[in-house]
């Protein structure tokens, strides 16, 4: 028979999305046991029928990768989990409406920091996503967010930071002291979607000035 409260078997059904990798996760409820099995279905907002996710039927793990199934940036999606206990009790819970554009979080960018004598160069590499374009290429975050920019900061000492920002991929902090260590942080920002990545950090030392030796 169905339990009085579905949360006895199943809790916190939600999408966790990072750089457009969309993972459905959930927790077992207080009456869940290790042999409780879970089956996952998904649907596009506006569609009537649910689709069973292959590879996520009668599983015991508490996550399911729905990246491919929820890969259309312009669509909204739902997913639901049905838990069935060893004793035959079942419960179903559905996610809130999911938009990958709105809900995905941004990972730190991939950056190369290059030391020079009186400057530090930072080259940001475009961040790939699992989403494929019509030509088969993987889209980058830059392909998806028109307003994406990079915010770069160089900690010079405890009280002074230098800042750069832009939509370019190559930056250089000039006027630095040779043979000195600096901490750089680089973030991806998308103001129109209120997104800000965790920072990439690089600790770099300017090269010694050999011209006086």
């Amino acid at each position: 028979h169905a339990p009085e409260d579905p949360s006895d078997l199943l809790q916190h059904v939600k999408f966790q999305s990072s750089n457009f990798e969309n993972i459905l996760t959930w927790d077992s409820g207080p009456e869940g046991t290790p042999d409780t099995v879970y089956s996952i279905e998904y649907k596009t907002y506006g569609e009537r029928d649910w689709v069973a996710k292959k590879g996520c039927q009668r599983i015991t793990r508490k996550s399911c990768n729905l990246t491919v199934e929820t890969g259309n940036l312009t669509e909204l999606y739902y997913a639901r989990v049905t838990a069935v206990s060893a004793g035959g009790r079942s419960a179903t819970k559905m996610t809130d409406r999911f938009s990958s554009l709105q809900h995905t979080t941004l990972k730190p960018p991939d950056v190369t920091c290059i030391s020079k004598v009186r400057s530090i160069q930072m080259i940001v590499h475009p961040t790939p996503t699992p989403i494929r374009a019509g030509d088969g290429h993987r889209l980058t975050l830059e392909d998806i967010f028109h307003d994406l920019f990079y915010h770069l900061e160089l900690q010079v000492n405890r009280t002074y930071q230098m800042h750069l920002g832009g939509k370019q991929r190559e930056y250089e902090f000039f006027g630095l002291t040779p043979d000195t260590e600096f901490l750089g942080t680089i973030m991806i920002c998308v103001p129109t979607w209120a997104k800000e990545s965790a920072p990439y950090m690089c600790r770099v030392k300017t090269l010694p000035d050999r011209t006086w030796t």
Epitope: D143, D147, Q168
Partner: antibody, heavy 117, light 107 residues
């Protein structure tokens, strides 16, 4: 050398349609943000629409939403602007432009669109 | 939408004059502000980006300053070839918006 060449402008009656084209060369067209910008006679500049040629993601200024459609043919390195339900206030020179290395620094020479009865 | 208010709409300058044009945004745009020059019958030419960074090949008499909501373009000594219209552009968020322009004429 980056080159952008617009075509397709002309005189059209209110309510009519036009399709503008922009032939691009000298850069990687298939992974870029491409823009249509217009300038009404004696007036300022206005961004009309933008498309990412790889993802197909588009944005429009509010005044043309539902009437204009931006698109590309990546095989032919060509940007389009389909303009329907044209109004007299759409009269302008229409430029295509592109963002390269983060900067909007390359523009075509423009094509004149005149909406008049 | 972010509205860019540019002033003055026109100005008369003598050759060698120092000219300042200002642009104000209705919300903070950090340093995502570019300045373009446009001559009659020509396409806009990028002069300054990132509020203060001079585009390659642009003479050093042009300079830009500002961040947040207030920005200025300065021509330290106007030359004949600088007589043109100047537009600011916010590149922070779509729709990208220009100021209404400043026409620099000879006094």
């Amino acid at each position: 050398e980056v080159q952008l060449v617009e075509s397709g402008g002309g005189l059209v009656q209110p309510g009519g349609s036009l399709r503008l084209s922009c032939a691009a060369s000298g850069f990687t067209f298939s992974s870029s943000w491409m823009y249509w910008v217009r300038q009404a006679p004696g007036k300022g500049l206005e961004f009309v629409s933008v498309i990412n040629t790889r993802s197909g993601i588009t944005h429009y200024v509010e005044s043309v939403k539902g009437r204009f459609t931006i698109s590309t043919d990546n095989a032919k390195n060509t940007l389009f602007l389909q303009m329907n339900s044209l109004k007299s206030e759409d009269t302008a020179v229409y430029y295509c432009a592109t963002r390269i290395q983060g900067l909007i620094d390359y523009w075509g020479q423009g094509t004149q669109v005149t909406v008049s009865s | 939408d972010i509205v860019m208010t540019q002033s003055p709409s026109s100005l008369s300058a003598s050759l060698g004059d120092r000219v300042t044009i200002t642009c104000q945004a209705t919300q903070s745009i950090s340093t995502f502000l570019s300045w373009y020059q446009q001559k009659p019958g020509q396409t806009p030419k990028l002069l300054v980006y990132g509020a203060s960074r001079l585009q390659t090949g642009v003479p050093s008499r042009f300079s830009g300053t500002g961040s947040g909501t207030k920005f200025t373009l300065t021509i330290s000594g106007v030359e004949a070839e600088d007589l043109a219209s100047y537009f600011c552009l916010q590149d922070y968020s779509w729709p990208l918006t220009f100021g209404q322009g400043t026409k620099v004429e000879l006094k």
